[in-house]
Interface confidence: low
C-alpha cells in the first residue's frame, strides 16, 4: 500500500478546523476490516486517532479529531482536527497497514492574525522638536512570532533605538510590544508594521506628531 500526503504544510488558523490529507490506494476487494489506520504525532509517537478491526477507535488526542468514515473505503484516510490550538502545531504521521504498510508525515502550521497595533507616546504633551520620545506599538494574540518594522512618514525604515518583546500567553499566542526611542523632528509620522510571516498579514499602526495635538 502506498500512502500519500500533501508535501506543503497545512496552514490552519487558531480556533478553526483543519484537514490533514492522507490517502492510500485500496486494492480490489478491499474491506475496512483489513485496515489499520493510525495517526500519531511524528516526534513523540503519541497516538492521535486510529481505525482498526473495522471500526473507528476514536480520538486519543483531546477529543478534537475525526476521520471521514464514509470515505475510508475509497482510500481517504484524512484527519479532521477541530478548534486548532497553537499546541497542535507540528508533524503528524499517517500510518496505513493492510497486508503491507506505508506511512507519510504531514506538517500542520498554526497561525493567528495580529490585531491592529495600538500606539502610545511618552511623554505625550508639551513636545518640542529635539525632544526624546518613546513610541510603543502593541499588537496582540498573533502566531507565530511577528516581524516588526518601523517606518517614517516617507515609508523609509527607522532602524534606530528599537526594542521588541514578544510574550506567549497561556494559549501560545503572542503579544508584541515594540518600543521606538526617537528624537522628534519638527513634525512627522511614525508607523509600526506588525507582520505575520506565515499569513503574510500586515497590521499597521501610526502616530503623527504635528506640534499639538497628536493624532493616532
Amino acid at each position: 500500500v502506498e500512502v500519500q500526503v500533501s508535501e506543503d504544510p497545512v496552514v490552519a488558523l487558531v480556533d478553526t478546523d483543519a484537514t490533514l490529507r492522507c490517502s492510500f490506494s485500496p486494492e480490489p476487494g478491499f474491506s475496512l476490516r483489513q485496515l489499520n489506520l493510525i495517526w500519531q504525532l511524528t516526534d513523540t509517537k503519541q497516538l492521535v486517532h486510529s481505525f482498526t478491526e473495522g471500526r473507528d477507535q476514536g480520538s486519543a488526542y483531546a477529543n478534537r479529531t475525526a476521520l471521514f468514515p464514509d470515505l475510508l473505503v475509497q482510500g481517504n484516510a484524512s484527519l479532521r482536527l477541530q478548534r486548532v490550538r497553537v499546541t497542535d502545531e507540528g508533524s503528524y504521521t499517517c500510518f496505513v497497514s493492510i497486508q503491507d504498510f506505508d506511512s507519510a508525515a504531514v506538517s500542520l502550521q498554526v497561525a493567528a492574525p495580529y490585531s491592529k497595533p495600538s500606539m502610545t507616546l511618552e511623554p505625550n504633551k508639551d513636545l518640542r522638536p529635539g525632544d526624546m520620545v518613546t513610541i510603543t506599538c502593541s499588537s496582540y494574540q498573533g502566531y507565530p512570532e511577528a516581524e516588526v518594522f518601523w517606518k517614517d512618514g516617507q515609508g523609509l525604515p527607522l532602524t534606530g533605538n528599537v526594542t521588541t518583546s514578544q510574550m506567549a500567553n497561556e494559549r501560545g499566542l503572542f503579544d508584541v510590544h515594540s518600543v521606538l526611542r526617537v528624537v522628534l523632528g519638527a513634525n512627522g509620522t511614525y508607523s509600526c508594521l506588525v507582520r505575520n510571516p506565515v499569513l503574510q498579514q500586515d497590521a499597521h499602526g501610526s502616530v503623527t506628531i504635528t506640534g499639538q495635538p497628536m493624532t493616532f
Epitope: T87, E89, G90, M167, A168, E170
Partner: antibody, heavy 121, light 107 residues
Amino acid sequence: QVQLVESGAEVKKPGSSVKVSCKASGGTFSSYAISWVRQAPGQGLEWMGRIIPILGIANYAQKFQGRVTITADKSTSTAYMELSSLRSEDTAVYYCANGGDSSSWYTFDYWGQGTLITVSS
Amino acid sequence: DIQMTQSPSTLSASVGDRVTITCRASETISSWLAWYQQKPGKAPKLLIYKASSLQSGVPSRFSGSGSGTEFTLTISSLQPDDFATYYCQQYYSYPITFGQGTRLEIK
C-alpha cells in the same frame, strides 16, 4: 495525575553553575508549560521563568536574565534549569511546577519535591 | 514588575475562627490572582485561581474574592490543618510575582 520528580540536592562553589532536572510523568508533557520557582531559606517564593516544551519557548524573569537557562527534552519528558555564576544568595530550594491538564499554565497545581542548592565556599 | 503586598505578615488565630488575608497588587491585574498554602518543608499547594475559583479537592471553607488591585483569601472556620503560610501570586503579566507570604499561627 501529573508527577514532577526533581534531581537531588547539591552543594556548589560560588561562581560555578548548577543544572537541576525535572522529570514529568502522567501527562502530555510537551503540551504544558514548566515553570521554575525558588525559595531561599525562610523566604518567599520567586518565579524564575518557564518553558513551553512543544513550542520551545522560554521566558525568564528579568532578575535572572543571562544567568538562567531553561530547556526541555520532549523525548524524556524532562525540563532543566541551569543557573550560572552562582553566589551565596542563590542558596535556595528550587521547584519545578506546572498547571496540569485544565488550569492556566501560570497557576501551579503540580510541583516537584524541591531541590536544595547550597552555594558555599 | 508588579509588586504583590500581603497583609498581615503574621496572623494569630484559633481553631474555628474566620480569618481574612489581604493581597494588594501595585497595578491592576484583573482577576489573574492565585492563592497557595505552604507548610514547612513542603511544596506550595494551589487553593484558589482566577481570584475566586476553588481548585479541585480544596475544602469549601477557603474562598477568594477581589479584582483589580485588592484581593482577599478567607477561611470561614479555621481547622488545625490550616495553620501554614499563605502566598498570593499574580499571573497577569511577566514576570509572575508572589506576595511575601502571611504566616497563620495558632493563638
